[in-house]
Amino acid sequence: MMTGTIETTGNISAKKGGSVILQCHLSSTMAQVTQVNWEQHDHSLLAIRNAELGWHIYPAFKDRVAPGPGLGLTLQSLTMNDTGEYFCTYHTYPDGTYRGRIFLEVLESSVAEHSARFQIP
């Protein structure tokens, strides 16, 4: 039975040209996290973090995506095209798969505020 819960940073905004941390956290389960995948709104992979083999960054994003902190992902040099949904997929044993959603809005304004609160989707 899947008892876990994914908490995410929810809806966040950040300034064009700046950076943002995408963060998910799996709680309420003793399952072993074997891999975390980070995907964009069109379900294309940004990065994979395998528990044993480490981070794998999609080549097209290697200059704009930094691993971490932790199982999270840092997006840098943000453009307006980065606006949209991001998904963290936790592959676990024995529970199976957990998925969290984050919505990122990239703003032109210099007053863009990066909210770092965690919420349960």
Epitope: H43, S44, H56, Y58, P67
Partner: antibody, heavy 120, light 107 residues
Framework: DVQLVESGGGLVQPGGSLKLSCAAS????????MSWVRQTPDRRLELVAT????????YYPDSVKGRFTISRDNARNTLYLQMSSLKSEDTAMYYC?????????????WGQGTTLTVSS | DIVLTQSHKFMSTSLGDRVSITCKAS??????VAWYQQKPGQSPKLLIY???SRHTGVPDRFTGSRSGPDYTLTISSVQAEDLALYYC?????????FGGGTKLEIK
Amino acid sequence: DVQLVESGGGLVQPGGSLKLSCAASGFTFSSYGMSWVRQTPDRRLELVATINNNGGSTYYPDSVKGRFTISRDNARNTLYLQMSSLKSEDTAMYYCATRTGTEILGFDFWGQGTTLTVSS
Amino acid sequence: DIVLTQSHKFMSTSLGDRVSITCKASQDVSTAVAWYQQKPGQSPKLLIYWASSRHTGVPDRFTGSRSGPDYTLTISSVQAEDLALYYCQQQYSTPWTFGGGTKLEIK
């Protein structure tokens, strides 16, 4: 040049045990996760064990869980696979493999393999 | 576990021909697919990763592509040294799994 050299294969009876070794050179062994991949006589490939760079995290598929143990000695640049309660279906060529660089998704370095035969 | 199906165990081709080796995933694996080549008596060699990224030193006649759950390794003009076994592998979900292999042979 990266080199992975497996050893320790042989003929074992069902229920027996064996320990394979993989000597690594040409890269900073302690910085990389490592895997064992086997190839059965019908040429199928199966990932059987993976370990992180410091040995603190391991992964096994259900087919070998509880019977195989992966470990490493970073001081000796050596990867190990301890196999017990061996079955005829464990008969295979065993390769150690790794990948370098965070862009690579897959195994870009493989050893030459060592053969395990489980038979009475 | 995710199953990768290489429906052709053998493929016959002529030197200079264009050939496409296919791999179908049982569920979405996005771009987390690699292709390997294995020649007789050798260990597998990485050709393609992230579905379409060519590994260092791999000739540009090898191309990887994706259409939904179907992944294709294309050799634009088959050379004698390309006659080998080809495997796909997914890394989207643990355990990472391999296809059953396709053996490329000369007609």
